[in-house]
């Protein structure tokens, strides 16, 4: 029951983390002008991955896109390339990751099958939610440098009578969105793991009951005379007796527990 | 059509407040910027300060202490209230509404006022 | 604050002539985000309200006469009426729309000879 329900939480974690990186990854106001210490302008500049955009105070708002892609800096293509791929490995992860929920049954999946899709979408969704935390983390690196950059020179004079307005730019929502959105798919793909770890069979508690006959370390198989060691690895059953209880998927899935010698 | 139509007291005392309504019909308040702009007689045109379709104000930095900006959207009106008036203030004072690039693309015809005791 | 200056404060013309008026800002009313200079250009009759001519420094309001051209970036701005007729005779002002106050230049007299 915990495995399942650390399996769904991890599920639904990981859709929101994803939904919110494709949002920050869509969203226009990735860096917004600074208005602290800048003179009082009647328009406000906000930039995207995609687009950049200028509000005027009169409540006009016009959108320019970035209709180059060698013009434009190597470290923004790079948060790009980052949010994207974190986009793509997200949805992967979730596709593998519905069919893997022990919810959801689909045939006679093995619990085994199931086990190996949860840890799939599990490294998926971490990989994903750290190639969102990386691109908006490398963008604001690029603004915090840019930043002082312009402090240094916010006012470039004109033969010292004329002043330009530097515009300077601060984090915007689609950072922080983004942030919260990889952190979400990290913990999300996390609990995927830790359900798979629950999920997987247990290699540990029994693996055959061998009867040791005299000088002799053989266990003896009924229904056959393939002999072989008692704790060796057996590729087709890794589980063979466990001991305990078991589900009726469990029941189906592997060898009866009267399979020992 | 677009119209603005600004109404005022016309004469006021020296040191007394004045209220000056600007009544807009075929556009929304919500939707546009509206500015006060004053002309004294025989010179030029001086900004006084705007309420945005937002409801934020922004004054000339000379008259902030002394002006106020409102309006009430349901009634389509928008208000400039003056303080401590002086004979300086004589104007033809006008209501315009902006757009494209914070500009005023619609006038209103003004009302005159006279400071004078 | 911002300073608008106009030049020259009156200009004498014939009909058909070229004019050309300035108008000088003390900070740059150049926006890097969209590229667009917030400079706006009015005409005022005597008796009526402004009329809006020219927003953007360049882009033309609806309805004006294509002879009215405006140019410039940054600090130093032109409106050019490439062929004056009896009806331009007005003053012309230029606004600053970028950073507050949004204060006008003294204005640019156009009278005929």
């Known amino acids: 029951m915990a495995v399942t329900a650390c399996q769904g939480l991890g599920f639904v974690v990981s859709l929101i983390g994803i939904a919110g990186i494709i949002a920050a990854t869509c969203m226009d106001q990735w860096s917004t002008q600074d208005l602290y210490n800048n003179p009082v302008t009647a328009v406000f500049n906000y930039q995207g991955l995609w687009r950049s955009c200028v509000r005027e105070s009169s409540g006009f708002t016009e959108c320019r896109g970035y209709f180059t892609l060698l013009g434009l800096p190597a470290m923004l293509q790079a948060v790009r390339a980052l949010m994207i791929v974190g986009i793509v490995l997200g949805a992967i992860g979730l596709l593998v990751s519905i069919f893997a929920l022990k919810c959801i049954r689909i045939g006679s999946m093995e619990d085994s099958a199931k086990a190996n899709m949860t840890l799939t979408s599990g490294i998926m969704f971490i990989v994903s939610g750290l190639c969102a935390i990386a691109g908006v983390s490398v963008f604001a690196n690029m603004l915090v440098t840019n930043f002082w950059m312009s402090t240094a020179n916010m006012y470039t004079g004109m033969g010292g009578m004329v002043q330009t307005v530097q515009t300077r730019y601060t984090f915007g929502a689609a950072l922080f969105v983004g942030w919260v959105a990889g952190g979400l798919t990290l913990i999300g793909g996390v609990m995927m793991c830790i359900a798979c770890r629950g999920l997987a069979p247990e290699e540990t508690n029994y693996k055959a009951v061998s009867y040791h006959a005299s000088g002799h370390s053989v266990a003896y198989k009924p229904g056959g005379f393939k002999a072989s060691t008692g704790f060796g690895s057996n590729t087709k059953n890794k589980k063979i007796y466990d001991g305990g209880a078991r589900t009726e998927d469990e029941v189906q899935s592997y060898p009866s527990k009267h399979d020992y010698v | 059509q677009v119209q603005l139509k600004e109404s005022g007291p016309g004469l006021v005392a020296p040191s007394q407040s004045l209220s000056i309504t600007c009544t807009v019909s075929?556009?929304?308040?919500?939707?546009?910027?509206a500015h006060w702009v004053r002309q004294p007689p025989g010179k030029g045109l001086e900004w006084l300060g705007v309420?945005?379709?937002?409801?934020?104000?922004n004054y000339d930095s000379a008259l902030m202490s002394r002006l106020s900006i409102s309006k009430d959207r349901s009634k389509s009106q928008v208000f400039l209230k003056m303080t401590s008036l002086q004979t300086d203030d004589t104007a033809m004072y006008y209501c315009?509404?902006?757009?494209?690039?914070?500009?005023?693309?619609?006038w209103g015809q003004g009302t005159t006022l006279t400071v004078s005791s | 604050d911002i300073v608008m200056t106009q030049s020259p404060s009156s200009l004498t013309v014939t009909a058909g002539e070229k004019v050309t008026m300035s108008c000088k800002s003390s900070?740059?009313?150049?926006?890097?985000?969209?590229?667009?200079?917030?400079l706006t250009w009015y005409q005022q009759k005597p008796g009526q309200p402004p009329k809006l001519l020219i927003y953007w420094a360049s882009t033309r309001e609806s309805g004006v006469p294509d002879r009215f051209t405006g140019s410039g970036s940054g600090t130093d701005f032109t409106l050019t009426i490439s062929s004056v007729q009896a009806e331009d005779l007005a003053v012309y002002y230029c606004q600053n729309n970028y950073i507050y106050p949004l204060a006008f230049g003294a204005g640019t007299k156009l009278e005929l000879k």
């Open positions: 075929g556009f929304s308040l919500t939707s546009y910027g």
């Open positions: 315009a509404r902006s757009l494209y690039g914070n500009s005023f693309d619609h």
């Open positions: 309420i945005w379709a937002g409801g934020s104000t």
């Open positions: 900070q740059s009313l150049f926006n890097s985000g969209n590229q667009k200079n917030y």
